[in-house]
């Protein structure tokens, strides 16, 4: 039961995380105009990975896409790439994890296959989360660098007569969404990996030792059970020594893994 809960929770957390990564990637507010001493501004600028926008205080908002690839900063391209890789890996991970869920029956899929798929999706979620966190962090670092550079020459004047106020940018909402979403995807991935350990059938089977008492044919077989999840996950143990000993399946009929959907 605990494995199923862990796997299910990992899936849900990752799903929320990937949805957040997609949302952050699409959001326009990766960087927003720093209002420093001017909380009320007539023209408010903000920028995303794909377009820059201007919101005028009168209510008019205009966004313009970056219709160039070569003209964009390499860092922005890198951030775009990291976020897209994160989304793609996360989406594939979600697809794999759906089939790996214990509560979903697909043909006669073995627990070992589900365990492998759970591990695969878990790793994909971890890498996806790391990509998102890395992308957002690279962008944040870029902002911090530019912020202090523009602060250094905040006012450039022509003989001190004409002032040109340079627009400074600070962290936008998308950065925080991205960090949280990346973290959730990472946590979801870790949970899937933990769930995988509980799903995987143990390979170590101990040989049965038969004790033949006079007039009886009773077998004592120590340690032949695998770690049970308590949710019908026991697989049939092979009959290793047939000296009148019976396998667990012959002794007690356990519910099939396919009985729970």
């Amino acid at each position: 039961m605990a494995v199923t809960a862990c796997q299910g929770l990992g899936f849900v957390v990752s799903l929320i995380g990937i949805a957040g990564i997609i949302a952050a990637t699409c959001m326009d507010q990766w960087s927003t105009q720093d209002l420093y001493n001017n909380p009320v501004t007539a023209v408010f600028n903000y920028q995303g990975l794909w377009r820059s926008c201007v919101r005028e205080s009168s209510g008019f908002t205009e966004c313009r896409g970056y219709f160039t690839l070569l003209g964009l900063p390499a860092m922005l391209q890198a951030v775009r790439a990291l976020m897209i890789v994160g989304i793609v890996l996360g989406a594939i991970g979600l697809l794999v994890s759906i089939f790996a869920l214990k509560c979903i029956r697909i043909g006669s899929m073995e627990d070992s296959a589900k365990a492998n798929m759970t591990l695969t999706s878990g790793i994909m979620f971890i890498v996806s989360g790391l990509c998102a966190i890395a992308g957002v962090s690279v962008f944040a670092n870029m902002l911090v660098t530019n912020f202090w550079m523009s602060t250094a020459n905040m006012y450039t004047g022509m003989g001190g007569m004409v002032q040109t106020v340079q627009t400074r940018y600070t962290f936008g909402a998308a950065l925080f969404v991205g960090w949280v979403a990346g973290g959730l995807t990472l946590i979801g991935g870790v949970m899937m990996c933990i769930a995988c350990r509980g799903l995987a059938p143990e390979e170590t089977n101990y040989k049965a030792v038969s004790y033949h008492a006079s007039g009886h044919s009773v077998a004592y077989k120590p340690g032949g059970f695998k770690a049970s999840t308590g949710f019908g996950s026991n697989t049939k143990n092979k009959k290793i020594y047939d000296g009148g000993a019976r396998t667990e399946d012959e002794v007690q009929s356990y519910p099939s893994k396919h009985d729970y959907v």
């Epitope: 023209v43 209510g59 313009r64 002032q163």
Partner: antibody, heavy 118, light 113 residues
């Protein structure tokens, strides 16, 4: 097309509060515009007093900020101006205007002359 | 506050001739986010409210004759009436629409010579 009409007393005594209302027709006061008050003393230039925007946020001219209040009544589709402690220098034609793209004043009321005199 | 200074204060031009009004701001009105200059031009005839002519320094408002054009960037702007008509006699104002408080120039009176 949005139409604006100012209304209020044409004469106000010094030190009293000037109150004007602008009634909006042909559009909603809650729509994506800013609703401004601008004044023009006789024979002089234009002075922006302040605005209330689509979300109810206000911005005022610092030179008048301590005396000005702009509010709105969405149910009546009106916005109003209150200017306290008036003096003869506040005698002007008061316009209400709508601003949108380019923060430019697109639609204007006809204006109402307010004279401050005892 | 951004100070807007118009020149000349008054201008007399013959019908059909070009009229040019200048406007200078004490601070740049260019917004780096969209590379637009937040300068607006208005026309005011006697006894009437001002009428919007040009916004974003060079974008003509719909319904405004194409003889009116705006140009300039940063701190220096120009309104040009390519061929003055009798109905263009009015006072013209430029406005800072970039930074609060929004401020107007003192106005330029255009008359027929």
């Amino acid at each position: 097309q949005v139409q604006l009409q100012e209304s209020g007393p044409g004469l106000v005594k010094p030190s009293e509060t000037l109150s004007l209302t602008c009634t909006v027709s042909g559009g909603s006061i809650s729509s994506n515009y800013a609703w401004n008050w601008i004044r023009q003393p006789p024979g002089k230039g234009l002075e922006w007093i302040g605005y209330i925007n689509y979300s109810g946020n206000t911005a005022y001219n610092p030179s008048l900020k301590s005396r000005v209040t702009i509010s709105r009544d969405t149910s009546k589709n009106q916005f109003s101006l209150k200017l306290s402690s008036v003096t003869a220098a506040d005698t002007a034609v008061y316009y209400c205007a709508t601003s949108y793209y380019g923060n430019s004043f697109i639609y204007w009321g006809q204006g109402t002359l307010v004279t401050v005199s005892s | 506050d951004i100070v807007m200074t118009q020149s000349p204060d008054s201008l007399a031009v013959s019908l059909g001739e070009r009229a040019t009004i200048n406007c200078k701001s004490s601070q740049s009105l260019l917004n780096s986010g969209n590379q637009k200059n937040y300068l607006t031009w208005y026309q005011q005839k006697p006894g009437q409210p001002p009428k919007l002519l040009i916004y974003w320094a060079s974008t003509r408002e719909s319904g405004v004759p194409d003889r009116f054009s705006g140009s300039g960037s940063g701190t220096d702007f120009t309104l040009t009436i390519s061929s003055l008509q009798a109905e263009d006699v009015a006072v013209y104002y430029c406005q800072n629409a970039y930074s609060f408080p929004w401020t107007f120039g003192q106005g330029t009176k255009v008359e027929i010579k």
